[in-house]
């Protein structure tokens, strides 16, 4: 759920790493209310996820490793 490119709330679903091509970080500031990880899926969707949740951290770690290898 996002508004003007800001996540307003987090997904209540768990996504598989195979579904995700990348991510961006949203930091809470004067523009956006919450910290979020925005996952970009193979279907072209942007999914707002809670950066404190373990499953989110795992995927971020996996994707970061991939990026560092390139």
């Amino acid at each position: 759920a996002s508004n003007f490119d800001c996540c307003l709330r987090y997904t209540d679903r768990i996504l598989h790493p195979k579904f995700i091509v990348g991510f961006t970080q949203q930091l809470a500031n004067e523009t956006c209310d919450i910290n979020a990880v925005v996952f970009h899926t193979k279907k072209g969707l942007s999914v707002c996820a809670n950066p404190k949740q373990t499953w989110v951290k795992l995927i971020v770690r996996r994707l970061s490793k991939k990026i560092n290898k390139m």
């Epitope: 679903r13 768990i14 996504l15 598989h16 195979k18 579904f19 193979k42 404190k52 949740q53 373990t54 499953w55 795992l58």
Partner: antibody, heavy 120, light 107 residues
Framework: QVQLVQSGAEVKKPGASVKVSCKAS????????MHWVRQAPGQGLEWMGV????????TYAQKFQGRVTMTVDTSTSTVYMELSSLRSEDTAVYYC?????????????WGQGTLVTVSS | DIQMTQSPSSLSASVGDRVTITCRAS??????LNWYQQKPGKAPKLLIY???NLADGVPSRFSGSGSGRQYSLTISSLQPEDFATYYC?????????FGGGTKLEIK
Amino acid sequence: QVQLVQSGAEVKKPGASVKVSCKASGYTFTNYWMHWVRQAPGQGLEWMGVIDPSDSYTTYAQKFQGRVTMTVDTSTSTVYMELSSLRSEDTAVYYCARGNYGVDYAMDYWGQGTLVTVSS
Amino acid sequence: DIQMTQSPSSLSASVGDRVTITCRASENIYGALNWYQQKPGKAPKLLIYGATNLADGVPSRFSGSGSGRQYSLTISSLQPEDFATYYCQNVLITPYTFGGGTKLEIK
């Protein structure tokens, strides 16, 4: 070795609640998710939801939203599944299963199952 | 939610036969698919994860293949202990839906 031991069979009246436990041993409890799957007599498998013991994050199938609650006690490596407002269609074997994101998010170990019978 | 359709729902075969069970997803699940075996009165057992990978301790006569929306489980030479019910499962996104199952019976 990995073991998931579930609580015993239950008989409940319609409208009541049931709480099933699943005690894990043989692995680092907080490193794996715990799923709950049920199977009505003669039917297939139905995924109910999952809990992450490391942060107590839960997500439930829409069908059970508002009726199911999954909780965790890390001190005893036990996960609980409570289902409320029981009806006859909830008669089933309820399984806990370890979710392993290292093997493609598969459920690699299962409890022995707990039969819950809902009958007036 | 992603729907998983298994076929056939039941299958009769003989020891030594080669059998294939198929599973079709309602949308692309990018190989995020697992297969389980269940015997009567027992809990399911993981056979294949990630569409093609054999779980620990599973005999090599079992194999998984497929991509996109279409997946299959093949048993190259049926053994007496393989007569059971088989389920596929989507793990791309919750809810982690199962197929309806395929009951493999002795002919």
